[in-house]
């Protein structure tokens, strides 16, 4: 028996369902009584789901997994993982034993889009050209860790005096706070781009300083 999985990682959004594809080629006359299918976490070998002795043995992984029972006899051994969490990320092994056995691993990459950044300024009044200001760009509930880029109004990257911190919450999602310290010119726009490297999703925020009032 030869087991086939997708070479590319499966990307799943947090709180959605994901399908880890796995297939085998049944011989003529194959019956489910011959099939032994085990899904497990590749690294820890923790059992996730199994089908043995002719029946679905069910989920061994927080009751969020399911097979496609009607498709098993056609060689579809895919696993459905419901309500994906950050902690589900990793490699899953699909093991199939009929007369012979084979296995293959498929990677699950979890992702969550970042919120539109909010911009804050400190100080936020009585600003004069030449003042040092702190601009904070905050974006929430994303995964994995973001890449943050700052640019001025002409699109020139600002790399000096940038401090970025990322903190995971109890669900493993990241809140990102990036602080730019800059000396004000006569007027100017400062934009922050928060990029999710897996989703290739960009979230933009900007602040324009033109004397008073400020534009966000």
């Amino acid at each position: 028996v030869e087991v086939q999985v997708s070479e590319d990682p499966v990307v799943a959004l947090v709180d959605t369902d994901a399908t880890l594809r796995c297939s085998f080629s049944p011989e003529p006359g194959f019956s489910l009584a011959q099939l032994n299918l085990i899904w497990q976490l590749t690294d820890t070998k923790q059992l996730v789901h199994s089908f043995t002795e002719g029946r679905d043995q069910g989920s061994a992984y927080s009751n969020r997994t399911a097979l496609f029972p009607d498709l098993l006899v056609q060689g579809n051994a895919s696993l459905r993982l419901q309500r994906v969490r950050v902690t589900d990320e990793g490699s899953y092994t699909c093991f199939v034993s009929i007369q012979d056995f084979d296995s293959a691993a498929v990677s699950l990459q979890v992702a969550a889009p970042y919120s539109k950044p909010s911009m804050t300024l400190e100080p936020n009044k009585d600003l004069r050209p030449g003042n040092m200001v702190t601009i904070t760009c905050s974006s929430y509930q994303g995964y994995p860790e973001a890449e943050v880029f700052w640019k001025d109004g002409q699109g020139v990257p600002l790399t000096g005096n940038v401090t970025t911190s990322q903190m995971a919450n109890e669900r493993g999602l990241f809140d990102v706070h990036s602080v730019l310290r800059v000396v004000l010119g006569a007027n100017g726009t400062y934009s922050c781009l928060v990029r999710n490297p897996v989703l290739q999703q960009d979230a933009h925020g900007s602040v324009t300083i033109t004397g008073q009032p400020l534009t966000f």
Epitope: V1, Q34, N36, T52, T93, S97, Q99, D100, F101, D102
Partner: antibody, heavy 119, light 109 residues
Framework: QVQLQQSGAEVKKPGSSVKVSCKAS????????ISWVRQAPGQGLEWMGG????????NYAQKFQGRVTITADESTSTAYMELSSLRSEDTAVYYC????????????WGKGTTVTVSS | EIVLTQSPATLSLSPGERATLSCRAS??????LAWYQQKPGQAPRLLIY???NRATGIPARFSGSGSGTDFTLTISSLEPEDFAVYYC???????????FGQGTRLEIK
């Protein structure tokens, strides 16, 4: 070509335990089935249990359940068989054997490890 | 647990003769059956797997047949080096537990 190198002969007291190792060289290890088979003097072959390292799941012959533990270390391509509560009837040659690619039949065998249980 | 019974226990033949060894399972093992040869002081050697497939390097005079509960190992024309003990082996579907027959001793007549 694949070879299975087993640890050396052991002499043990009744009631003690023995741990025999089996190191694979010259081929992949994790995705093959490893079995342990013993043969008492003048007797036939007796399967004790086996493991597929990639799965980490061992299973045992009913007769040895609770007394034998089979493990595999993928990082060193080594399988282990530990037999506890030894008695004189456990005196035998212990073989490790590897299945063919994706198979449970045993196409490569170690040379065997003699375990003698004597007070 | 499936029991394999081999017959005869001992078979006495001369070089050049045909040897037929039998292995009977107490219940169907499909075609999950293998045959091994063992000579004194040596580890067993795989001859046949999946009832009828010759293992790598095994001479064509060895052949296997059968399915379900009745299996046969045939050596078409015995060579002096073929005199040894022969074991059949099966495995259950899941978990993959293995049992051996008690062996057939093939001796020179």
């Amino acid at each position: 070509q694949v070879q299975l190198q087993q640890s050396g002969a052991e002499v043990k007291k009744p009631g003690s335990s023995v741990k025999v190792s089996c190191k694979a060289s010259g081929g992949t290890f994790s995705s093959y089935a490893i079995s342990w088979v013993r043969q008492a003097p003048g007797q036939g072959l007796e399967w004790m249990g086996g493991i597929i390292p990639i799965l980490g799941i061992a299973n045992y012959a009913q007769k040895f359940q609770g007394r034998v533990t089979i493990t595999a270390d993928e990082s060193t391509s080594t399988a282990y068989m530990e037999l506890s509560s030894l008695r004189s009837e456990d005196t035998a040659v212990y073989y490790c054997a590897r299945g063919g690619s994706g198979s449970y039949h045993m196409d490569v065998w170690g040379k065997g490890t003699t375990v003698t249980v004597s007070s | 647990e499936i029991v394999l019974t081999q017959s005869p226990a001992t078979l006495s033949l001369s070089p050049g003769e045909r040897a037929t060894l039998s292995c009977r399972a107490s219940q169907s093992v499909s075609s999950y059956l293998a045959w091994y040869q063992q000579k004194p002081g040596q580890a067993p050697r795989l001859l046949i797997y999946d009832a009828s497939n010759r293992a790598t390097g095994i001479p064509a005079r060895f052949s296997g047949s059968g399915s379900g509960t009745d299996f046969t190992l045939t050596i078409s024309s015995l060579e002096p080096e073929d005199f040894a003990v022969y074991y059949c082996q099966q495995r259950s579907n899941w978990p993959p537990r293995i049992t051996f027959g008690q062996g057939t001793r093939l001796e020179i007549k």
